[in-house]
């Protein structure tokens, strides 16, 4: 009689998953851009702000061509996890000035968390090496002043914007190799 009928398709193909991950990343990029603009309007930035605890930018656009799927997803997930921790820290310790960025900062945190889970699922479906999603990390020290919190917010949103921009390009390029 032949084999029994197989199960219906229950979940998206990894390539479709990559498509929806790109859409989610683009949407998060737009949110970050908007929130960074909102922050600049309320608290104009005096030059570039850096935060030593933030990850360095993963890759220049020109070097994207040499990337391999496991490396991109692993690095992207590690960097986004760091930004998620920083956003959580900002909401908790950023001070009253940054309360004006709510509920947008909360929405950003939720979407960042969703993107991280999407990346983890994608790596699982592809059976790529999976470093721990929640590695232990040293606690971040609270900002020294209200202005310190605002400077940190500029640095976090600016760095996240660049990382997400890199992520969209990288994920689109990887889709062609899957």
């Amino acid at each position: 009689p032949g084999p029994p009928p197989g199960p219906p398709r229950v979940s998206p193909d990894p390539r479709a998953e990559l498509d929806s991950t790109v859409l989610l990343t683009r949407s998060l990029l737009a949110d970050t851009r908007q929130l960074a603009a909102q922050l600049r309007d309320k608290f104009p930035a005096d030059g570039d702000h850096n935060l030593d605890s933030l990850p360095t930018l993963a890759m220049s656009a020109g070097a994207l061509g040499a990337l391999q799927l496991p490396g991109v997803l692993t690095r992207l997930r590690a960097d986004l996890l760091s930004y998620l921790r920083h956003v959580q820290w900002l909401r908790r310790a950023g001070g009253s000035s940054l309360k004006t960025l709510e509920p947008e900062l909360g929405t950003l945190q939720a979407r960042l968390d969703r993107l991280l889970r999407r990346l983890q699922l994608l790596m699982s479906r592809l059976a790529l090496p999976q470093p721990p999603p929640d590695p232990p990390a040293p606690p971040l020290a609270p900002p020294s002043s209200a202005w310190g919190g605002i400077r940190a917010a500029h640095a976090i949103l600016g760095g996240l914007h660049l990382t997400l921009d890199w992520a969209v390009r990288g994920l689109l390029l990887l889709k062609t190799r899957l």
Epitope: P7, P70, S124, L126, A127, P129
Partner: antibody, heavy 114, light 111 residues
């Protein structure tokens, strides 16, 4: 409709070898990591091995390391498990599974006995 | 000895709500890896029931739900039906093994 069809199981003596195959259809085989999972009679599920979508990463359970080899041929939409130095405790239904695993075959029975 | 710990059995009457627990360690569930749940009806292959802690594949009724906290996870089945009688397994990736690990399975009986 997703289909995973295992074959190659049977009765083999301790120390012998078998090669299991899993023919996939109804989905983009080359985009999925593939697993072998086994279930001894009346027991629970035990993961055996996994191979990444492109075959570049392979991992094994400690209980089969050095004896079993997983491989795939994306041009044929087929997954393989080469089993050597078989032991009585390898007796089980062997399932091939795709993704998380999201999809499972119906399994093939491997019996190791003298 | 399974890496993830589940109760060997659970039971309930039709219409009731039952939960099945799954406890792991710092190398799997506690490390942040997602938990997936499978249903295995007698004499059949396992079927994905819940993935990524609480996501339902298409075709799975919303009576089934999952949650995760710390090093453990749970599967809840509400409005229990006779066709839910099956073995239920949890699974999660394990960073030290570089592969998924399964719970020992829970046999659910509908009284």
């Amino acid at each position: 409709e997703v289909q995973l069809l295992e074959s190659g199981g049977g009765l083999v003596q301790p120390g012998g070898s078998l090669r299991l195959s899993c023919a996939a259809s109804g989905f983009t085989f080359s985009s999925y990591g593939m697993h072998w999972v086994r279930q001894a009679p009346g027991k629970g599920l035990e993961w055996v091995s996994v191979i990444s979508y492109d075959g570049s990463y392979k991992y094994y359970a400690d209980s089969v390391k050095g004896r079993f080899t997983i491989s795939r041929d994306n041009s044929k939409n087929t997954l393989y498990l080469q089993m050597n130095s078989l032991r009585a405790e390898d007796t089980a239904v062997y399932y091939c599974a795709a993704g998380v695993p999201d999809y499972w075959g119906q399994g093939t029975l491997v019996t190791v006995s003298s | 000895q399974s890496v993830l710990t589940q109760p060997p059995s659970a039971s309930g009457t039709p219409g009731q709500r039952v939960t099945i627990s799954c406890t792991g360690s710092s190398s799997n569930i506690g490390a942040g890896y997602d938990v997936h749940w499978y249903q295995q009806l007698p004499g059949t292959a396992p079927k994905l029931l819940i993935y990524s802690n609480n996501e339902r594949p298409s075709g799975v009724p919303d009576r089934f739900s999952g949650s995760k906290s710390g090093t453990s996870a749970s599967l809840a089945i509400s409005g229990l039906r006779s066709e839910d009688e099956a073995d239920y397994y949890c699974a999660a990736w394990d960073g030290s093994l570089n592969g998924p690990v399964f719970g020992g399975g829970t046999k659910l009986t509908v009284l």
